[in-house]
């Protein structure tokens, strides 16, 4: 016995044989093939969508989602309410705010109900799954002949978030980076003025608030200085 | 082939402590959620400690507080600090491991995992 799975990431997995033979004897039946993985993101902390890779399974199967939070008031099961389709199967589900709770452990519970005894259950932190959105309104301002000060502003708390800029010139072959706290603003001190600086930044919900791993998309790119860079050998590269 | 061998099990007072190991053989842990699980006669099998690959780790109500989950993956070895031990404890502990695509993912759910150990006995009196 050697099923095939196509797991998550859409490489195949050969490990059948031992899921179906090496549990201990009080498991589930030798029919049950395992669930596709549920990964789920907290956007802004406005609304999380949990998704899962509906292709995995052998057959088209719309599985369901419920959840809940362990250990606290909200603990009831909750069914899904707003399922997320891939061609016209479930594969994800959508929370709403009222339904986010950071500091709860989320359980949340995957299922073929066709096969109800074929369940998978996960616990995740949602504090650590939470993406903010890119950074807006990116401003600059001269504070001496020779020192820039980038500004941003985040649609969230921000003492919650940290930040990574990223600059470079019309010369530069890639981008300089710097970390920066929760400040939300960057000071380079050394401008040159014959040259076109390009910034962007994005933030990410960590250190303070939660552990998250998964940065905002990049803001709108902002630019100072020079237009005209004749003698530049990179220019026409960087901005195809 | 893949194998889990769990040691550390035993019999203690209540109060004392111990700690399990888990090694295994045959693949990495790095990316594998992990789980220590346990039965006791008559009762169903429940987790005790469960970890994703990315370091989020949940523990049990009973036990939370008084057990510790831990890697190493150098050592492809997982272990479970067990302090405070009651009677209640007494039970066959397993070592279960699950390779995940995510980080985040950690099975509460046995049938979740694809491998799995003998298992160590762990017994408490009082």
């Known amino acids: 016995l050697n099923t095939t799975i196509l797991t998550p990431n859409g490489n195949e997995d050969t490990t059948a044989d031992f899921f179906l033979t090496t549990m201990p004897t009080d498991s589930l039946s030798v029919s049950t093939l395992p669930l596709p993985e549920v990964q789920c993101f907290v956007f802004n902390v406005e609304y999380m969508n949990c998704t899962w890779n509906s292709s995995s399974e052998p057959q088209p199967t719309n599985l369901t989602l419920h959840y809940w939070y362990k250990n606290s008031d909200n603990d009831k099961v909750q069914k899904c309410s707003h399922y997320l389709f891939s061609e016209e199967i479930t594969s994800g589900c959508q929370l709403q705010k009222k339904e986010i709770h950071l500091y709860q452990t989320f359980v949340v519970q995957l299922q073929d109900p066709r096969e109800p005894r074929r369940q998978a259950t996960q616990m995740l932190k949602l504090q650590n799954l939470v993406i903010p959105w890119a950074p807006e309104n990116l401003t600059l301002h001269k504070l001496s002949e020779s020192q820039l000060e980038l500004n941003w502003n985040n649609r969230f708390l921000n003492h919650c978030l940290e930040h990574l800029v990223q600059y470079r010139t019309d010369w530069d072959h890639s981008w300089t980076e710097q970390s920066v706290d929760y400040r939300h603003k960057f000071s380079l001190p050394s401008v040159d003025g014959q040259k076109r600086y390009t910034f962007r930044v994005r933030s990410r919900f960590n250190p303070l608030c939660g552990s998250a791993q998964h940065w905002s998309e990049w803001s709108h790119p902002i630019h100072w200085g020079s237009n005209t860079s004749k003698e530049n050998p990179f220019l026409f590269a960087l901005e195809a | 082939e893949v194998q889990l061998v769990e040691s550390g099990g035993g019999l203690v007072q209540a109060g004392d402590s111990l700690r399990l190991s888990c090694v295994a053989s045959?693949?990495?842990?790095?990316?594998?959620?992990m789980g220590w699980f346990r039965k006791a006669p008559g009762k169903e099998r429940e987790y005790v400690a469960i970890?994703?690959?990315?370091?989020?780790?949940f523990y049990e109500d009973s036990v939370e507080g008084r057990f510790t989950f831990s890697r190493d993956n150098a050592k492809n070895t997982v272990y479970l600090q067990m302090n405070s031990l009651r009677p209640e404890d007494t039970a066959v502990y397993y070592c279960?491991?699950?390779?995940?695509?995510?980080?985040?993912?950690?099975?509460?759910?046995?049938?979740?995992?694809?491998?799995w150990g003998q298992g160590t006995q762990v017994t408490v009196s009082s």
């Open positions: 279960a491991a699950a390779p995940t695509s995510f980080a985040t993912t950690a099975y509460s759910s046995s049938n979740s995992y694809a491998y």
């Open positions: 045959g693949r990495t842990l790095s990316r594998c959620a």
């Open positions: 970890s994703s690959w990315g370091g989020d780790t």
